[in-house]
């Protein structure tokens, strides 16, 4: 059983790790299927976890063209690691009013990854801010 602060620290580590995974995939953008994918941007408050799940559901795929296939597939799979439902559910009070994944603008892999990174950075910033202000609801 993790203490609350330990759990929060691990949560932050996981979120930062996702940014590193996105950065790694950006190195291999030419080895990804050039498909257009829903890429949330300027996500409204309280819809961050909904947008996060849209990024995770997107069919980012290796083009299977070369020697980087293994690291790409491993990285994509790690990007789809599901956070515990308490993280997403507890914080997503207004998730029923959030846009559907299909309603977001579709972008090629490079922009998709940039927008995913931007959302992750925003979520980390919010999490740190809420901790600073002593709020549970990060």
């Amino acid at each position: 059983h993790k203490s609350s602060s330990q759990g929060q620290d691990r949560h932050m580590i996981r979120m930062r790790q996702l940014i590193d995974i996105v950065d790694q995939l950006k190195n291999y953008v030419n080895d990804l299927v050039p498909e257009f994918l829903p890429a949330p941007e300027d996500v409204e408050t309280n819809c961050e976890w909904s947008a996060f799940s849209c990024f995770q559901k997107a069919q980012l795929k290796s083009a299977n063209t070369g020697n980087n296939e293994r690291i790409i597939n491993v990285s994509i799979k790690k990007l789809k690691r599901k956070p515990p439902s308490t993280n997403a559910g507890r914080r997503q009070k207004h998730r029923l009013t959030c846009p559907s994944c299909d309603s977001y603008e579709k972008k090629p892999p490079k922009e998709f990854l940039e927008r995913f990174k931007s959302l992750l950075q925003k979520m980390i910033h919010q999490h740190l801010s809420s901790r600073t202000h002593g709020s549970e609801d990060s």
Epitope: Q6, Q17, I71
Partner: antibody
Framework: QVQLVESGGGVVQPGRSLRLSCAAS????????MHWVRQAPGKGLEWVAF????????YYADSVKGRFTISRDNSKNTLYLQMNSLRAEDTAVYYC???????????????????WGQGTTVTVSS | EIVLTQSPGTLSLSPGERATLSCRAS???????LAWYQQKPGQAPRLLIY???SRASGIPDRFSGSGSGTDFTLTISRLEPEDFAVYYC???????FGQGTKVEIK
């Protein structure tokens, strides 16, 4: 304590088969991906294969693809490496290693192989 | 496939000296994906550094890692007798190892 113990090594003729096992203890085996890594006599480390924590994905080095199969039995906390069509160049010490990135969101998060067995020796010779 | 090139092949130093080991990647590597291992004769490798600069559990603070992109460094600030061994860098995800650097007693 956290431990990995390999077994199944030995001397085998070229073209024959061998199955290695790796018994895990001291941690939740089903939460971790697992690797096989080998080291030929006097040489460096060579990654051989990886299996996802739930067995859903497997990856192999080009040198063993089509000949070796990695598998796991989470109910027995055991990792396996089935080696077919063995060649002289497969002669090595074979290590199993735990992938340090747990499937648990709040678990270990190391991008590296953080626990290793002591190794089992495979010699392919006629 | 990415290639990791370690240099020098062998480093001859005395206890108490500083050791600097290099690992160069043929393509850019995200820092999270770079690990270092130590292997002593007759023993299994041991994870020293993950994420390019984070020490694994139980690793003394004389070991440090740095670098980004294609150039990474493992530094042993003051060599102890037990540090003489072979060191490998590795890219996580492709799990490619460098060829190793042997740190031997001068």
């Amino acid at each position: 304590q956290v431990q990995l113990v390999e077994s199944g090594g030995g001397v085998v003729q070229p073209g024959r088969s061998l199955r290695l096992s790796c018994a895990a203890s001291g941690f939740t085996f089903s939460s971790y991906g697992m690797h096989w890594v080998r080291q030929a006599p006097g040489k460096g480390l060579e990654w051989v294969a990886f299996i996802w924590y739930d067995g859903s994905d497997k990856y192999y080095a080009d040198s063993v693809k089509g000949r070796f199969t990695i598998s796991r039995d989470n109910s027995k906390n055991t990792l396996y490496l089935q080696m077919n069509s063995l060649r002289a160049e497969d002669t090595a010490v074979y290590y199993c290693a735990r992938d340090g990135d747990s499937s648990d969101w709040y678990g270990d998060y190391y991008f590296g192989m953080d626990v290793w067995g002591q190794g089992t020796t495979v010699t392919v010779s006629s | 496939e990415i290639v990791l090139t370690q240099s020098p092949g062998t480093l001859s130093l005395s206890p108490g000296e500083r050791a600097t080991l290099s690992c160069r990647a043929s393509q850019s590597v995200s820092s999270s994906y770079l690990a270092w291992y130590q292997q002593k004769p007759g023993q299994a490798p041991r994870l020293l550094i993950y994420g390019a600069s984070s020490r694994a559990s139980g690793i003394p603070d004389r070991f440090s890692g740095s670098g980004s992109g294609t150039d990474f460094t493992l530094t042993i600030s003051r060599l102890e007798p037990e540090d003489f061994a072979v060191y490998y860098c590795q890219q996580y995800g492709s799990w490619t190892f460098g060829q190793g650097t042997k740190v031997e007693i001068k």
